[in-house]
């Protein structure tokens, strides 16, 4: 059997040893015990008698089916109790009694049916962050569960398998920062919202199957809520679901993020929100964010037109990795308040681009994120956005392009253009001379040559260039990041030519250590103000005897040098 | 209705490895989570492993957490489970099921296959 490992500070790591029992030895010096991954199945009474100051104890994944009433009670000082995927099944008030400076406790995926015959957390008034639950065997909440909290950052619960609800359980905490309910169906939902409706600032719903969700009104006085975000993960929706959810707006007036993540609808975006009243309701949402979400018949999708009154105050939506090949020109033409769009990883091509930012469209948009669609004419695409007259920030990164000719117009206020992992050999006149910012990095770039007068940061990392562009193209350049490129050696003169250069980041270069390279760096400790990734990232490609040396420690051979 | 059809059980010695498939018949497997169980001779069913819809979430039970991998393929209407560090323990009847719900309770599947057995010897 090994030993814990501990380091000076009193942290010890116990993780993956084979222990069948908390090893011996323990004292109270230690304030950091993770003995996670082990086989100790049980925790006897005297076994952490003498970690009289620990803080922080892991025991996660170590088989633990049974603890001692009283094998916590000298723990006074412990912040942190992570008891995660053991095989507890059940819990006992005992061992958190003496737990009062307790910030967070991991119960998950243990195989209790309920959190105990008594409340568990009385006493555990400093608690920020709770953890409970588990897929398969956790069936009840009860309004015992939570007495004694009042205020948590964090509340997680797993309850997969819930059957009963006891009504008012959840309410009794009067603050929750972050809620995650893991729920596989919508039957307690309903109560569970009313509870939580006066306490939870930010509610993210796990794993739900919403299909057959349906609205009731809540039995709830006039409530001003804290709700600000609202999000959906892995959940299953129909256009019908999608309706009724929409009814419960009108309880979180205060609503202004909503985010579906790896969720399926089971539908054809038939939506029809007006008769659900909710179009004033939305007026705070002013962030939408979609991604991964699954439609099976979505090239019978609808154009969302009955949806289109409700968006038109959101300020910025995402719809990422959902096979969008179109936004039609009505819809841009309602979004009339965006200034944040994101289609990233989408099937979006110039023709259909041209539709969905056709005149009108998107008045108020600022940024547009086209990364990774199909789009193959950065010619074409900048005229096509000609019509964004706001439009100052432009990502069609990862987005496999033609050669780029030498003329190209882009919209006239455009600042920032990324133009990343797009397979580009040359740079050329049609990248605007406006810009402020440029993201050219992960091409096949082996030399920049272009004048940019305004340009401030220059991204330029993982291409094929062998020395630093000349600083006369970049008169106002504060930022270069050119790693893992092809440069061999830089000089005072160079970066001293860059007038303004603040940061430049240039490390995992072939350097050639040469007499005058490793002169100027020894010779100039200011180095490591201006080179972020300054030393560590700087190693010599050659001459052979100091390959992979750091150019901070190798040094010149005198004989060398002074020939 | 989906039908399941198990395979890949069979004998192996504590500590090796095992992969369980389960074939989906029917056109809408995409829509079905998917799950896990085994039972033990003399036991009751007991819940393995879970994944949702898009393959995007998985659970497991605590006591094989970090031995076993649940994943699916929804474009062959298969679901796997990758079985490694067995232990004689593990040696029990595992199904695979069918349901509209994300969850460990055995009684919210409405489709199940016959079995596969595995035997862990030690």
């Known amino acids: 059997q090994e030993s814990l490992s501990c380091d000076a500070s009193g942290v010890c790591d116990g993780r993956s040893r084979s222990f069948t029992s908390i090893p011996s030895g323990l004292t109270a010096a230690m304030k950091s015990l993770d003995l996670s991954f082990n086989k100790i199945t049980y925790i006897g009474h005297g076994d952490l008698r003498a970690c009289a100051n620990l803080q922080v104890l892991i025991l996660k994944s170590s088989r633990i089916n049974t603890i001692e009433g009283d094998a916590f009670y000298s723990l006074g000082s412990l912040e942190h109790l992570d008891l995660s995927d053991n095989h507890l099944s059940s819990l006992s008030s005992s061992w958190f009694g003496p737990l009062s400076s307790l910030k967070y406790l991991n119960l998950m995926g243990n195989p209790y049916q309920t959190l105990g015959v008594t409340s568990l957390f009385p006493n555990l008034t400093n608690l920020q962050t709770l953890r409970i639950g588990n897929v398969e065997t956790f069936s009840e909440i009860r309004r015992i569960d939570f007495a004694g909290l009042t205020s948590l950052n964090e509340l997680e619960i797993k309850a997969l398998s819930l059957r009963n609800y006891q009504s008012q359980s959840l309410k009794s905490i009067r603050d929750i920062h972050h809620l995650t309910l893991h729920l596989s169906e919508s039957a307690f939902l309903l109560e569970i919202f009313a509870d939580i409706l006066s306490s939870v600032r930010y509610l993210e719903l796990r794993d739900t199957n919403l299909a057959r969700f349906q609205f009731s009104p809540l039995p709830v006085d006039e409530v001003s809520s804290p709700m600000k975000k609202l999000a959906f993960r892995g959940s299953v929706l129909t256009d019908e679901s999608f309706n009724e959810l929409l009814k419960l707006l009108r309880y979180i007036l205060e609503l202004s993020e909503v985010e579906f993540d790896d969720c399926t609808l089971n539908g054809l975006g038939d939506f029809n929100p007006s008769e659900s009243d909710v179009v004033s309701e939305l007026g705070k949402v002013e962030t939408v964010t979609i991604r991964r979400l699954h439609i099976p018949q979505f090239y019978l999708f609808y154009d969302l037109s009955t949806v289109y009154s409700l968006l038109e105050k959101v300020k910025r939506i995402t719809v990422e990795n959902s096979k969008v090949f179109l936004v039609p020109c009505s819809f841009s033409q309602h979004l009339k308040s965006l200034e944040f769009l994101d289609l990233s990883e989408n099937l979006m091509v110039e023709e259909y681009l041209k539709n969905s930012a056709c005149k009108g469209a998107w008045p108020s948009l600022q940024t547009l994120v086209l990364s990774q669609n199909h789009l193959r004419s950065m010619q074409k695409t900048g005229e096509i956005l000609l019509t964004l007259k706001n439009l100052t920030s432009l990502d069609i990164s990862r987005n496999t392009f033609h050669p780029m000719p030498d003329s190209c117009q882009w919209p006239e206020k455009m600042r920032f253009l990324n133009l990343s992992s797009t397979g580009i050999r040359v740079v050329k006149t049609c990248i605007p001379q406006t810009l402020e910012v440029l993201d050219v990095s992960n091409n096949n770039l082996d030399s920049f040559s272009l004048f940019l007068p305004r340009l401030q940061e220059l991204y330029i990392s993982r291409n094929k260039l062998k020395t630093l562009p000349d600083a006369s193209l970049f008169p106002v350049l504060l930022v270069m990041k050119i790693r893992e490129n092809a440069v061999s050696t830089f000089s005072k003169d160079q970066l001293g030519s860059f007038p303004k250069l603040e940061t430049l980041e240039a490390g995992d270069n072939h350097f050639v250590c040469s007499c005058e390279l490793l002169s100027f760096t020894m010779e100039t400790p200011a180095l490591a103000q201006i080179l972020v990734d300054w030393p560590d990232s700087y190693l010599c490609d050659s001459p052979p005897r100091l390959h992979g040396h750091r150019l901070q420690d190798a040094r010149p051979s005198v004989l060398e040098c002074h020939q | 209705e989906v039908q399941l059809v198990e395979s890949g059980g069979g004998l192996v010695q504590a500590g090796g490895s095992l992969r369980l498939s389960c074939a989906a018949s029917g056109r809408t497997f995409s829509r079905y989570v998917m799950g896990w169980f085994r039972q033990a001779p003399g036991k009751e069913r007991e819940f393995v492993a879970v994944?949702?819809?898009?393959?995007?979430?998985?659970d497991y039970s605590t006591y094989v957490k970090g031995r076993f991998t649940i994943f699916r393929d929804n474009a062959k209407n298969t679901v796997f489970l990758e079985m490694t560090s067995l232990e004689p323990e593990d040696t029990a009847v595992y199904y695979c099921?069918?349901?509209?719900?994300?969850?460990?309770?055995?009684?919210?599947?409405?489709?199940w296959g016959q079995g596969t057995p595995v035997t862990v010897s030690s």
């Open positions: 994944i949702n819809w898009s393959g995007g979430s998985t």
């Open positions: 099921a069918a349901g509209e719900y994300y969850t460990g309770d055995s009684s919210r599947y409405d489709h």
